[in-house]
Each structure stands twice: as C-alpha cells, then as structure tokens.
C-alpha cells in the first residue's frame, strides 16, 4: 500500500495473506474471508500456480513475521477461477479458494459481507484498501498490514484515465486525482472494504493499475456486486 499507515490487530479480520510454498514460502496475494470455507481473491494471483497444494492461507495475521514453520494455516482444496478470465485488465479477475478445513470465527478472523445487488446505487464514501504489498513500485513486502482510505472514482472518469483499456461495469475504480495513495505490488487479491450503515462490505478486489499511486491513474478493482450470483453459485454447489 502506498501512502498508507499500519493497521491494528483485528481491524480487518476478513483479510488473509495467501502464501505460495514453491520454490520457497512467500506472500503471494491478499484475500478476504467470505464464508467459513471460502476466500475471495483475484484470478491473476494464480498465474504460474499449477496446484492448490502449494498454497497456504493465513488468517488473523497482522505481521508477516508471525508466520513461522509451526504457524497454523488453511490448506486449499480447490481454486475456482472465473471461466471468462483471461487477464486482469480484461475483467473477470475473480477467484474463490475452497479451504480444506473450516474457519472458526473469532474477533481476529471473520467474514466480510458481500454487497447486496439492491445496493448497486449506494455511494460509498468510506472505502479502504489493505495489504502487505510494496510502499512504492520498487520495494518489498511489508511486515505489518497497511491501510489507506481511498475515494471511489466513477467509471466514466476512470475510463478517461485508461484510454487504452475498456473499463467495464464489472470493474470499479478508486484513487486520488493527484495520486499518493494506492494499492501496489503484493496487495492484489485483497479487499477494497467500504463501510455503509455501520456494516463493512467487500466492494472490490484489488486487480490492476498502471504504476502505483500515480497521478490520474486510479486503481482498478473487480466490482464484487456484479459477481454475487457467480459467488453464490460456486459456494453453494453441492
């Protein structure tokens, strides 16, 4: 996260750190708990990932340094990538991880609500992007979970900033015109969380952008409300 500040324990209890163990263990992407066996993240996180066996999901984590060899984690049973996904910038950048075991909800690990399709016209004014990613484009993964408050940008405005791309209604953008605060490398797959009527909603999944926190280059997120039916179909399948 560029221009962010350190989070405190339990502030974002739905945020997980997804690790790969191949060739060595490291943070790969963020993700969000949306059910006791389900993590919502970005499809692009799985480029080069051949098997769910190399993935580990850590919940209730504030500092990456808490993760040691004996730290408990959730194995991944299945990676479900949207079948229309090709690359982040074309949309459909959404994936579900089905965990091998269920998450026991506590103050430090619990789900975030999905937005309701009836709330499509809600104007969210309290949105935060979180993650352990870089603080600038050439940096390293951060130890402490960072947060930054970022305003949503209309799709019309976002399209003006990305003329070489098609910003669809299935994407949502956030950023300051002057830049300065944004997601960055290692934050992808994580949540864009917005508080509305005292309830936190998973409005976006960190997907792509040109550079990090650049002027007139907002971050582009998967617009979760447009995938609620897909999420329900996949998570409720027998």
């Amino acid at each position: 996260i560029v221009g962010g500040t350190a989070s405190v324990r339990g502030e974002w209890p739905w945020q997980v750190t997804l690790h790969t163990t191949s060739p060595t263990q490291r943070h790969l992407c963020g993700g969000s708990i949306i059910g006791n066996q389900w993590i919502l993240t970005a499809a692009h996180c799985f480029y080069g990932v051949e098997s769910p066996k190399i993935l580990r999901v850590y919940s209730g984590i504030l500092n990456q340094s808490e993760i040691k060899e004996d730290t408990s984690f959730f194995g991944v049973q299945e990676i479900i990538i949207h079948d229309q996904y090709k690359m982040a910038e074309s949309g459909y950048d959404i994936a579900l991880l089905k965990l091998e075991t269920t998450v026991n909800y506590t103050d430090s690990q619990r789900p975030i609500s999905l937005p309701s399709k009836g709330d499509r016209n809600v104007i969210y004014t309290d949105c935060w992007v979180t993650g352990w990613g870089y603080r600038k484009l050439r940096d390293k993964i951060q130890n402490t979970l960072q947060k930054a408050k970022i305003p949503l940008v209309t799709n019309e405005e976002c399209q003006k900033r990305y003329r070489g791309h098609k910003i669809t209604h299935k994407m949502i953008c956030a950023g300051y015109r002057e830049g300065g605060k944004d997601a960055c490398k290692g934050d992808s797959g994580g949540p864009l969380s917005c508080k509305h009527n005292e309830v936190w909603h998973l409005v976006g999944i960190t997907s792509w952008g040109e550079g990090c926190a650049q002027r007139e280059r907002p971050g582009v997120y998967t617009n979760v409300v447009e995938y609620v039916d897909w999420i329900l179909e996949k998570t409720q399948a027998v």
């Epitope: 191949s22 060739p23 490291r26 943070h27 790969l28 992407c29 970005a42 692009h44 996180c45 480029y47 080069g48 690359m87 982040a88 910038e89 990613g133 484009l137 050439r138 390293k140 993964i141 003329r163 070489g164 791309h165 997601a183 960055c184 490398k185 290692g186 934050d187 992808s188 960190t206 997907s207 792509w208 952008g209 040109e210 550079g211 990090c212 650049q214 971050g219």
Partner: antibody
Framework: EVQLLESGGGLVQPGGSLRLSCAAS????????MHWVRQAPGKGLEWVSS????????SYADSVKGRFTISRDNSKNTLYLQMNSLRAEDTAVYYC?????????????????WGQGTTVTVSS | DIQMTQSPSSLSASVGDRVTITCRAS??????LGWYQQKPGKAPRLLIS???TLQSGVPLRFSGSGSGTEFTLTISSLQPEDFATYYC?????????FGQGTKLEIR
C-alpha cells in the same frame, strides 16, 4: 500470432541519427511495457530503454541517456527508438521486447516476446 | 543500480549431464528474475519467469530456483538443442540489468 517486427536499422556515420520502429501484432499493445535491448557483435545482451504502457514513463541506460528517445504510438501498435549522436559503440543488433506487469501483483512476468532484431552499424 | 554477476562465463558439458548456472544480484530483487536462452543469430527466448516459473513450451528439464540475491538455472539432463548462451535478467528496477551470459558448449 503474437509478433514484433523491428525495422529502420542500417549503416550510419558517427554523429548521425537513426529511427528504429517495432511493429506489434497479435496482442493488445497498449497493455504492455515495451523495451529495447541491444547486442554488440560477439557481446552479451544490454538493456537500452523502456516505456510504460501509456507512454508516460520512460527509462534509459546511462550509456544512451540524452542521446536516445523511446516513444510509442498505441493507435498504430508501434514502438520507436530515436537515436541521435550515434557512436561506434552503438553498433549492435537492436531488439524490441514486450513485458507484462501488473503493478499490484507480486510476480515478475519477464520479457516473453522478442522481435527478430534490426542491425545498426555506426562507422565512417 | 543492481549488478547481476553470472557464473560461469562458459561451460563445456556432454549430452545427459546436469548443469547449473548461477546469477548473483548486488541487492535484494525478490523473485524478479528471468532466465533466457539465445542461439547464434536468433533473438533471446524466455525460459523462466519470476525466478522459478517455467514458460509454456519449455522442457521440464529446465528449472529455476532462488530468491533475494542468489538464483540458479538447472538443466537436469542436457540435450543437443540446449547448447546455447544463457542470460539472467533482473526485472526488479531500472535500469534493467543482464548477467554477462554463460556459453554452454559441447565437450
């Protein structure tokens, strides 16, 4: 088919200028970082310059800074390298290459597609 | 600037041999390293991205490992078509820097 095709190379005198082009086809050019890489006869690969997808950010090797200018025209799917004040040591095969980067993803994709190269010879 | 030191600069080996090429970065580059193969008169070809991900179409005898400052490319059992020059390239920052190359020759 994904392809990069360089052109514009040739023989030029020291102090002269040349403009290289790289025509892209088979992919969405405007979504990729583009690079110029060169290789002097019998030598290794040397990165020369790169440009961001929108063209707003450019970088140069110290050896060409102030003499070479990279640019792109996304409407024409073409990358350029304007080379001024050419020196004998600029003699090389010049390759263009594409590189995908998602600024938010902790993953290095590499330069996965290269052109066949165009030869620049600087000699009197 | 990050310097990439590749070793050895040349290597003689036989078909069937196991070969290892090393690249050392002067600073921490995470996993932002690619390995390239180049044959005479041809453009380089990306073999491995992100230090260890094999590109599609690249034979499984090639593998990459390492992170931070130490990286290796291993060819488990050399085939005749593997005799070429190999380069590492750091993609962490600008200027991008290549290793000096390793020329793999038939013994």
């Amino acid at each position: 088919e994904v392809q990069l095709l360089e052109s514009g190379g040739g023989l030029v005198q020291p102090g002269g200028s040349l403009r290289l082009s790289c025509a892209a086809s088979g992919f969405t050019f405007s979504r990729y970082i583009m690079h110029w890489v060169r290789q002097a006869p019998g030598k290794g690969l040397e990165w020369v310059s790169s440009i961001s997808p929108s063209g707003g950010l450019t970088s140069y090797a110290d050896s060409v800074k102030g003499r070479f200018t990279i640019s792109r025209d996304n409407s024409k799917n073409t990358l350029y390298l304007q080379m001024n004040s050419l020196r004998a040591e600029d003699t090389a095969v010049y390759y263009c290459a594409r590189e995908f980067e998602n600024a938010y993803h902790y993953y290095y994709y590499g330069m996965d597609v290269w052109g066949q190269g165009t030869t620049v010879t600087v000699s009197s | 600037d990050i310097q990439m030191t590749q070793s050895p600069s040349s290597l003689s080996a036989s078909v069937g041999d196991r070969v290892t090429i090393t690249c050392r970065a002067s600073g921490d580059i995470g996993n932002a390293l690619g390995w390239y193969q180049q044959k005479p008169g041809k453009a380089p070809r990306l073999l491995i991205s992100d230090a260890s991900t094999l590109q599609s179409g690249v034979p499984l005898r090639f593998s990459g490992s390492g992170s931070g400052t130490e990286f290796t490319l291993t060819i488990s059992s050399l085939q005749p078509e593997d005799f070429a020059t190999y380069y590492c390239l750091q993609g962490y920052n600008y200027p991008r820097t290549f290793g000096q190359g390793t020329k793999l020759e038939i013994r």
